[in-house]
Each structure stands twice: as C-alpha cells, then as structure tokens.
Amino acid sequence: FNISGCSTKKLLWTYSTRSEEEFVLFCDLPEPQKSHFCHRNRLSPKQVPEHLPFMGSNDLSDVQWYQQPSNGDPLEDIRKSYPHIIQDKCTLHFLTPGVNNSGSYICRPKMIKSPYDVACCVKMILEVKPQTNASCEYSASHKQDLLLGSTGSISCPSLSCQSDAQSPAVTWYKNGKLLSVERSNRIVVDEVYDYHQGTYVCDYTQSDTVSSWTVRAVVQVRTIVGDTKLKPDILDPVEDTLEVELGKPLTISCKARFGFERVFNPVIKWYIKDSDLEWEVSVPEAKSIKSTLKDEIIERNIILEKVTQRDLRRKFVCFVQNSIGNTTQSVQLKEKRG
C-alpha cells in the first residue's frame, strides 16, 4: 500500500548500555476528530467526508505493523521478520535495545472498510542511540520499585537529572493508556498499591531549528514489600527422625520459606554429618514451588539410591540462608521395624 499519506512521528530512544531496557511504539491512529489524514484526499476543515473516519471505534487491537527497509525494498511484516519485536494489541514491544532497531515502522488497521481508510496509517521514524557518558550519571533506572503501603515516585529516566522547574511537559502512559493528568517528569504516588505495578512510558518533545521529535523512555514498575527482617524457616522436614527401609531408595525433601528481599540470594543445601566429618552433598537443583509478593518457598531434595546401614549412623542436614541469617534442620534415619 502507498505510505505517502501516512501521518509521521519521529521518536528517539536513548538506551543505557549498563542495563536491560525495553521500548514500545503505540499505533497512534488518529481519533475521529483528528483524522483528516485518514482519507486518500486530504480535506480542509470545511469539507466533510462522505464516510466516517476509520477510528470510529476505540478498538485498536486489530492493527498490522510493518518495517520499511532502508534500501527501498517492500514493507516487511514485523511478526515474520523480527523475533525480538513483539506485537501486543496496538503496541510494538522491543525486547532488546540496539541501534539496529532504528528505522521506519508503519502501522495501519488490518480491516480496511472503505477506500477512505487506505491512508489511515502512522509512520514512526525511530532513531536509537546509546547513552553517552556525558549524560547524567544518576539517571533513573528503567526498572523501578515501589514499596507497598508507603509513598513513592516514578521518574522518567530521560529527564531524571533535570529539576521539576526545568523539565518540559511530559506525557505519561501506563500499560498503553494515557495518564492525561500526569505532566511532570516525576509521578508522585501517595500510597503504593499493587495496581501501581506495570509498564510506564514517558514522552517529551525535543526540537531544533529544523524539526521536532519525541524522546521516549519505558519504565517497568514493580510493587514490592519491604525486605524481610527474618531468616528463612524450614517447613519440611519437621521431624528430626525418619523411618526408612534398608536397601530401598529414599528422597528427603527440604522446603524452606524465604521472605522477600530486593536483592535475593537464597541458599538451600544438604550436607551430611558422620562422626566428626561433615560434607556437602551434590543434589538436584533447588526449585521454587510457590512465590508470592511476601515470600518464596524453595525446595531441594537429597536422593539416596539405596539406604545402607552406614546411612543410619549419619545425620542429614538441610541448611538454608538469606542475608539475615541461616537455619538448619537435621534428620536421623531409623530402620523401620516389623
């Protein structure tokens, strides 16, 4: 299709080489009142089209995205050619940063209902640059945490070094929806609730003498509880003796609950005590069996191919640790009678 009639928007993505970062493009098809370019023939305000503009409905889930190759080749369907770019409804998600994402992206409705809809499309010229060292050292992260129940704020990474007074007007989106009343480079959250979690996008306009473009940054906001003040507790085994049958295989499970920590480095391991000797056992990897906002339950098993007489003289110890401290639970094997 002919893209010369598409409206054009220029965007800049300045990414940090230090952190993982995502980016999004919205299919900003015009609303009915702004949609004079959704028609093959541009209309003056006094002219009235015979057909309603395409975007009569707010359902933007059915759009098609293309990339325009720089060599003038035909448009490429994003979904077929770019595995690191994902389409979710009307939003295009770039999962990895890099200058190779620079280019022209076109979106238009899948359903063309009338000849007037042919040029109902948006062309986004995306320029991607790595952040220069000259940029501010303490810019806000693209991953920000909000502590549940407390106050907090969400900062626009590309503007976080500027004072509120210097900052240009910012347009914020949350999960693709416009937050029309938020206009500063920092959103103040009076009290953090779980619904504050999500993907926030901040846009502001920069211009020079020739043209203007939108500078965009994406912030992943996570709502968290405060770091635990407790060491992990062992949920299983509970008993310190276990009845076993000699010669049979045996699996002993150690399940431990770890409270939330922002920097989470849980340790769960098994070791064996035999008189004065003590050694760590090579056992299968630990696995998370339940994860909530407040805590995580991790399990690690010790597997004996067959229980021997020697095993009855040993103690099997599960050791768990977080940044606060450690807990142990030992199990003595006892032969089953009868």
Partner: antibody
Framework: SLEESGGGLVQPEGSLTLTCTAS?????????MCWVRQAPGKGLEWIAC????????TYYASWAKYRFTISKISSTTVTLQMTSLTAADTATYFC????????????WGPGTLVTVSS | AYDMTQTPSSVSAAVGGTVTINCQAS??????LAWYQQKPGQPPKLLIY???SLASGVSSRFGGSTSGTEYTLTISDLECADAATYYC?????????????FGGGTEVVVK
Amino acid sequence: SLEESGGGLVQPEGSLTLTCTASGFSFNSKYYMCWVRQAPGKGLEWIACIYTGTTGSTYYASWAKYRFTISKISSTTVTLQMTSLTAADTATYFCARDDRVEHGYGLWGPGTLVTVSS
Amino acid sequence: AYDMTQTPSSVSAAVGGTVTINCQASESIGSWLAWYQQKPGQPPKLLIYSASSLASGVSSRFGGSTSGTEYTLTISDLECADAATYYCQSTFYGVNPVPTAFGGGTEVVVK
C-alpha cells in the same frame, strides 16, 4: 464527623477562607480531604483535594487551580482559601473525606453557604 | 481531571419499576467510579464504589455495572424514598485514588 465554617456574604473580587474541622478521627491516618461545591439548584462540582499522608499532594479542578488553595492546617483542620470571587462562586461548599476502603466520599459535612454579592 | 457525562438529566418511573442511569468517562478510569444519591438540603450519600460494589448499609436494589468507559447505575423495585438526584464520580486521578470529577446529575422522579 466533619463541619464546615467560614461561609457568609462576600463582595465580588473579595476573598474568603473556609475551614473544615474533623471530629472523631484525625488526619494522622491517611485520607484525601476534599472540597466540593453546589450552586443553588445545580449539580455537584469538585474543587480540590489534599492527601493527609506524607506526600501532602494537592489536586485541583483546572478552573480552581489559580484562585483556590487547599491546605492542611492541623491534624483535624483543612482550609480552602478563595480569591477573586464572583457571583458564579455563590454555592454551598461541602467538605468531604474519602473512604479508605470504599473509594469515594464516605463522609460529608453539612455544608456552608457562600454568597458573593454587592 | 476527567470529564464525566451523565445521561439522562431526568427520568421518571413508577413505584416498583426500574431506572437506569448512564455515565460516560472521557478516558479510561477502569473500575474507579462511584455513585451518590442526594436529597434536597442534604449532603450526598455514597451508594456504589469501584463501579459495582455496594457501599455499606445500601440496599441491594441499587446496582452498578461497567463496560469500557460506560458506567450504569440501576435502581430496581423503585420506592418513593428513591426520589433524589444521582451523581457519578471518577475516583481516580493519574495514578492516585483521588475522588474528583462528578457527572452532571440525574433527577429521579418516582410516580
């Protein structure tokens, strides 16, 4: 309960400060304390809110931003300062508190009448 | 803040009947919507919060529902005491749960 005071007759272009006093609870808990007005025979019109938690955030209707100022004076008192008043500001002014669970104004004062006239 | 458009401005129905009042938000506010009842000379009373949850002490004859940016208050089995003006209100502002803009109101007349 909530009680508004400070209403009365004021000259056009004059100023007035309304006070909302809470009893039975204090703003040491976190609430949105707000002002709403209702012109005679007309609908409800939101004016402003203040968050009584640590951020102290204030929120204004676009038309109220430059003439009206909401403030928390103490743990039981919120005020609304109004300047450059005109006849269009004649209304009953209500103080209201949001409900922490049932989001919306769960508690209202009886209202105070402000008349702007020469 | 947001613009809330309420329709109709007035509606009348017989005792035992049903009344439906609509409210349209200028942009998406999710479930952040409240409904109030106001009788002459009194402050408003909260009926519904979070678009469809009944405020404490409110009769189950009042119900709220939502579809996109359209919100509906339904009063069934109408009683004389339901004669009042009803208002919708957005209870969200940006990212904070601030009760702000009201709809224009709907007068309910019970015959």
